[in-house]
Amino acid sequence: SIPWNLERITPPRYRADEYQPPDGGSLVEVYLLDTSIQSDHREIEGRVMVTDFENVPEEDGTRFHRQASKCDSHGTHLAGVVSGRDAGVAKGASMRSLRVLNCQGKGTVSGTLIGLEFIRKSQLVQPVGPLVVLLPLAGGYSRVLNAACQRLARAGVVLVTAAGNFRDDACLYSPASAPEVITVGATNAQDQPVTLGTLGTNFGRCVDLFAPGEDIIGASSDCSTCFVSQSGTSQAAAHVAGIAAMMLSAEPELTLAELRQRLIHFSAKDVINEAWFPEDQRVLTPNLVAALPPSTHGAGWQLFCRTVWSAHSGPTRMATAVARCAPDEELLSCSSFSRSGKRRGERMEAQGGKLVCRAHNAFGGEGVYAIARCCLLPQANCSVHTAPPAEASMGTRVHCHQQGHVLTGCSSHWEVEDLGTHKPPVLRPRGQPNQCVGHREASIHASCCHAPGLECKVKEHGIPAPQEQVTVACEEGWTLTGCSALPGTSHVLGAYAVDNTCVVRSRDVSTTGSTSEGAVTAVAICCRSRHLAQASQELQ
C-alpha cells in the first residue's frame, strides 16, 4: 500500500492504490548536495548522475572505518525520496549529486559554497530547464552561505533546505535562515512535529512549511534493492524538493516567489499541534504541511499572499523590526505584534526602492515584531498614503484617493508611549470602506494599489466582551491582504494574518475589565483579482 508520507502529500483526487500523480517532474533537474550516493540502486537507477564534485572534510577519529554503504546512506535515501520509482515524490525527476558531506555526515561551509558555485557555473555553461537545489544539511548561522544561496536564487534556481534537527529556532542555522531558500521542518504521520531523541525539528519564522519527516521509507545503500526508514528535516526537505519538481514540470515558468506562494497555498493548514513548540515560537511558526496541488494547472487566477514575520526588535526603547517581501512580491499591508502590548505601531516605508514593514517598540516594551503581508500581484502599482496625527476628536483618517486604487492594508504608528489608554475607541464611519482610521495622536498609513481587475472589501468582527483573540476570515475566492485592529482598544497586543484569517490578540482577559475598553474589533481587508481569473480562463 502507499506509504503514509506519499499519501499525506497527495490530494484526494490523486489517491488510488498507489501514488501516481500526473507528470513526475520530468522537465526538472534536482541537484542534491549531500553524502556520496549509490546511484545504481534499483529505486533510482538511471535517475541520478553523480557529478565529479567532491569537497568534504576528513572523518573524525583514528578508528573510523569507511564502510561504503554507511557513507552512501543519507544521500541514497534522499535521492530515493525525491525521485525513487517506488517511494519517490517526483518519479520522473532527474537528479545530479554533489558530495559535500563525508561518511559521518559532516561538511564545511566552504565545501557547500564551492558546491553552489559549481551548480551556478554548470547552469551558465549548459542551461537546462527549471533547477531545484536540495540542501539537506544545517550548520550554524553563516552570512556568507546565506549570501551564496541568495545569489543562486536570484539567478532563478529554487533552493530547498532542511530546517535542522536541533529543536531550536531555524533562524540560528544556515542555510535555513536564508530568506530566499525554502526552509522545511519535519512532521510525523500524526501531523505532529518530529522528535528525534532529545531533539527534533527546528521551528520559527525562518521555516516556510513542514513536510513528512519521520519513518520515511526510501532506498537503502545496504544493498541494491534494499529499503530503509529514516527520519529528519532532510527527509522533509526532500519531499518539498519533489513537490517543487512536480509543480515546475507542470508550470516551468514559475518564479521562486510564485512557487513558494503555491507551496504555502496548497499546504494542509492548522493540523500541527503547536503545543510542541516553545510558547514564544508558536505564533511565528507556520502551521502548514506541504502537499501537491490538487491540479497542476489553473492556479494562476488566485491572488496568493503569505505572512512574513520579522526578527524580534529587541527591548530597547527605540528598537524597530523590519519585515520584507521577496523581490517579486508586493507588500500589501503591514502590522505589528508585541507580547507585552507595549509598541508604537508600524508603518510601511520605502527602502532601496521597495516597501518594507517597520514596527516600533515602546518604552518599557520587551520588543516587537513587524508582520508583512506579501502578495503576488502582477502589474501592480502600489503606494502608501499617510495622514499625520489629526488632533481632531474624530481621529485620523486616510483613504485611497487616486482613481482605480483600492485599499489593501492599514497601519498606524504613534510617538506617544501610552496611546489609547483611557480613551474611547474611535469607530470607522460606516459606508466608507476605502479608508483607514486611527487615533488622533497616530499617523495612519493606507496601502493603496492599482492592478488590473483588483477589487477589495473590508470585513470586521467585533466582540464587546474582552477576549484574548478575535478573528475574522475572508470567504472562499477572496484573499486576506490586510489585518488590523480597530483603534481604541489599549490592550491589543497586535494583529497578524494566519493564512486567510486576520487575528487580533489582546492581553490576558483576566487583567482587563469588561468595559468598552474590552471591546476588540478585528478588521480584515479581503481582495481578489478578476483579471487573473479571466486570464486563466482564456489559457485553459
Epitope: S39, D40, E45, G46, R47, M49, V50, A68, D86, T225
Partner: antibody, heavy 115, light 107 residues
Framework: QVQLVQSGAEVKKPGASVKVSCKAS????????ISWVRQAPGQGLEWMGW????????NYAQKLQGRGTMTTDPSTSTAYMELRSLRSDDTAVYYC????????WGQGTTVTVSS | DIQMTQSPSSLSASVGDRVTITCRAS??????LNWYQQKPGKAPKLLIY???TRPTGVPSRFSGSGSGTDFTLTISSLQPEDFATYYC?????????FGQGTKVEIK
C-alpha cells in the same frame, strides 16, 4: 550513444569455466549496474544476476548455486560474468543489459558446452 | 520468486490487425514491468517500461497498460516488422523474472 559490446563466442568442455566480458560506453557508468541474462536454444530468457559498477555489489539468482561470479572493472568500463563447472545445459546465448530495468542490451555471446 | 504468466504463447495475425498480449504476475508488482521484442538471432529490444511508458524511438502503435498483477501489451495495427517474440519482465523483486514469451506469426 549507449553501447554494450560483448566478447566473442566460446566453446568449452564440461567442467571448465568461461568468462564473458561486456564493455559499456555512452552513459554515466555509476548510474546503472549490469544485469546478465541467458537464453538457451529455443527457450525463453533467464535472469542470472546484477553487478554494480559503483561498488561491485552483486545480486545473484539462486539457480547459479555459487557457480557464477559477476565483477566490474570501472577503469576499463567493463563488466564480467564468470561461470564455473560448466554443464551441457549451460549452452546458451549470454547477454549483458544495462541496470535492473535492462533498457539496453549487448549483442550476446554464444557459449557452447560440449565434450 | 514472482511468476510471470504470458498469454497466448503464440498467435497468428495479419498486417493491420490489432494484437493484444497479456501478462499476469503471481503477486503485486506495482508498475515495475517491461515489455521486450526479440527477433531470431538478435538481442531483446525494450518496447515498454514502467508498464506503460514508451522509450524514444519505439513506434506509437505499441502501448502498454495495467498495474498490480495484470498487464497488457497492445499493437494497434500490426506491421510486417512486428512479427517476433514478445516477453514481459518484472523487476519489482529479485530475481527479475520473464514471461515465457508470445510468438506473433503471420497468418
Amino acid at each position: 550513444q549507449v553501447q554494450l559490446v560483448q566478447s566473442g563466442a566460446e566453446v568449452k568442455k564440461p567442467g571448465a569455466s568461461v568468462k564473458v566480458s561486456c564493455k559499456a560506453s555512452g552513459y554515466s557508468l555509476t548510474s546503472y549496474g549490469i544485469s546478465w541474462v541467458r537464453q538457451a536454444p529455443g527457450q525463453g530468457l533467464e535472469w542470472m544476476g546484477w553487478v554494480s559498477f559503483y561498488n561491485g555489489q552483486t545480486n545473484y539468482a539462486q539457480k547459479l548455486q555459487g557457480r557464477g561470479t559477476m565483477t566490474t572493472d570501472p577503469s576499463t568500463s567493463t563488466a564480467y560474468m564468470e561461470l564455473r563447472s560448466l554443464r551441457s545445459d549451460d549452452t546458451a546465448v549470454y547477454y549483458c543489459a544495462r541496470g535492473f530495468g535492462m533498457d539496453r542490451w549487448g549483442q550476446g555471446t554464444t557459449v557452447t558446452v560440449s565434450s | 520468486d514472482i511468476q510471470m504468466t504470458q498469454s497466448p504463447s503464440s498467435l497468428s495475425a495479419s498486417v493491420g490487425d490489432r494484437v493484444t498480449i497479456t501478462c499476469r504476475a503471481s503477486q503485486n508488482i506495482n508498475n515495475w514491468l517491461n515489455w521486450y521484442q526479440q527477433k531470431p538471432g538478435k538481442a531483446p529490444k525494450l518496447l515498454i517500461y514502467g508498464a506503460s511508458t514508451r522509450p524514444t524511438g519505439v513506434p506509437s502503435r505499441f502501448s502498454g497498460s495495467g498495474s498490480g498483477t495484470d498487464f497488457t501489451l497492445t499493437i494497434s495495427s500490426l506491421q510486417p516488422e512486428d512479427f517476433a517474440t514478445y516477453y514481459c519482465q518484472q523487476w519489482d523483486d529479485t530475481p527479475n523474472t520473464f514471461g515465457q514469451g508470445t510468438k506473433v506469426e503471420i497468418k
